[in-house]
């Protein structure tokens, strides 16, 4: 079942999912100047069985200047450079959490996708928190949140994490280097926008992995 609400917001912290449970939706969103093709998929869906899960449907974007066409527009070098600024290196995760039964890896990017990924989580999904750059974590317990079903309603558990304003950065499990963090957003924002990192889980041969920072909405 889909989770009604967003994962809790922790001051000066971001969260991410290491893997996505079956039933998770990722909206097919396109960057400015592009739109989802008219008969294109509305969303990608993590689907499968206990032994193998994958993302169903493909997102396709077309230039909004080109009406009712499925023409794929290749980003200009300038646009590619702009996208590249959100990527950086980070150490490999110690556990390939996407190999968990009933879970999907981070879906690969599609051409001209929006810089903001909009996921819709399902019951049982876990997200992990870390303090943004310039803040240090004070743990009172697990820095994670799980969407649970209680009395027919969904709710997220409260992560036990406080981020204090010291120039050290707490990392996700197994990470050693600090990651760049996005600009702080206005506190008045009521749209449930959250910043999270998207992980391309690598094979054991890979020494590093690319991590893109997305502003992601979960409503």
């Amino acid at each position: 079942e889909l989770c009604d609400d967003d994962p809790p917001e922790i001051p000066h912290a971001t969260f991410k999912a290491m893997a996505y449970k079956e039933g998770t939706m990722l909206n097919c969103e396109c960057k400015r100047g592009f739109r989802r093709i008219k008969s294109g998929s509305l969303y990608m869906l993590c689907t499968g069985n206990s032994s193998h899960s994958s993302w169903d449907n493909q997102c396709q974007c077309t230039s909004s200047a080109t009406r009712n066409t499925t023409k794929q527009v290749t980003p200009q070098p300038e646009e590619q450079k702009e996208r590249k600024t959100t990527e950086m290196q980070s150490p490999m995760q110690p556990v390939d959490q996407a190999s968990l039964p009933g879970h999907c890896r981070e879906p690969p990017p599609w051409e001209n996708e929006a810089t903001e990924r909009i996921y819709h989580f399902v019951v049982g999904q876990m997200v992990y928190y870390q303090c943004v750059q310039g803040y240090r974590a004070l743990h009172r317990g697990p820095a994670e949140s799980v969407c649970k079903m209680t009395h027919g309603k969904t709710r997220w558990t409260q992560p036990q994490l406080i981020c204090t304003g010291e120039m050290e950065t707490s990392q996700f499990p197994g990470e050693e280097k600090p990651q760049a963090s996005p600009e702080g957003r206005p506190e008045s924002e009521t749209s449930c926008l959250v910043t999270t990192t998207d992980f391309q889980i690598q094979t054991e041969m890979a020494a590093t992995m690319e991590t893109s920072i997305f502003t992601t909405e979960y409503q």
């Epitope: 739109r35 169903d56 749209s191 909405e217 409503q219």
Partner: antibody
Framework: QVQLQQSGAELVRPGTSVKISCKAS????????LGWVKQRPGHGLEWIGD????????NYNEKFKGKATLTADTSSSTAYMQLSSLTSEDSAVYFC???????WGQGTSLTVSS | DIVMTQSQKFMSTSVGDRVSVTCKAS??????VAWYQQKPGQSPKALIY???YRYSGVPDRFTGSGSGTDFTLTISNVQSEDLAEYFC?????????FGGGTKLEMK
């Protein structure tokens, strides 16, 4: 919680136009496609079209091209559907609906009568 | 346009029964099918997305299944509050189209 609040019932004359509103709350209005659906007894549900407020992009069911015009005001998180050259065939309940994950407004009853 | 056919306009049932509402698409729509419940004077309420996944708050007695052209909404252990009209919808191809509806009635 996602909510779509539609404007009240309308009684209008044939040949005129009407504009129905749908105010969204509980989510980021600009990030989701919002559709409009017509329901008439004996005719079931018909998809009129949809709009992406973030870019003003629209899709229309061919059947409703020239009849319906979809717009959105991002400053007030409100979507609008204007129906023109009204006839008795346009008498129906009209729903706005966030396309996915689906969430529907309460409906607006339109009666076209002289 | 893709035609969604719900062959049974009415279905009679009793509390505690198991009932299956069927829907057939005129062409392959994959699993891009949703099911809605509508009670008199109310707007449709989304029950199922992607043919088989439940929306939050939807009791687990509602189960969706199928892919391609044939889809089923099964209600096990029918409750009195389940008496309503049920619609399928495809969103695989534009324009999105709905089935004609199946009204669940008490025997």
């Amino acid at each position: 919680q996602v909510q779509l609040q539609q404007s009240g019932a309308e009684l209008v004359r044939p040949g005129t136009s009407v504009k129905i509103s749908c105010k969204a709350s509980g989510y980021t209005f600009t990030n989701y496609w919002l559709g409009w659906v017509k329901q008439r007894p004996g005719h079931g549900l018909e998809w009129i079209g949809d709009i992406y407020p973030g870019g003003g992009y629209t899709n229309y069911n061919e059947k409703f091209k020239g009849k319906a015009t979809l717009t959105a005001d991002t400053s007030s998180s409100t979507a609008y559907m204007q129906l023109s050259s009204l006839t008795s065939e346009d008498s129906a309940v009209y729903f706005c609906a966030r396309v996915t994950p689906a969430s529907w407004g309460q409906g607006t009853s339109l009666t076209v009568s002289s | 346009d893709i035609v969604m056919t719900q062959s049974q306009k009415f279905m009679s049932t009793s509390v505690g029964d198991r009932v299956s509402v069927t829907c057939k698409a005129s062409q392959n729509v994959g699993t891009n099918v949703a099911w809605y419940q509508q009670k008199p004077g109310q707007s449709p309420k989304a029950l199922i997305y992607s043919a088989s996944y439940r929306y939050s708050g939807v009791p687990d007695r509602f189960t969706g299944s199928g892919s391609g052209t044939d889809f089923t909404l099964t209600i096990s252990n029918v409750q009195s509050e389940d008496l309503a009209e049920y619609f399928c919808q495809q969103y695989n191809s534009y324009p999105y189209t709905f089935g004609g509806g199946t009204k669940l009635e008490m025997k």
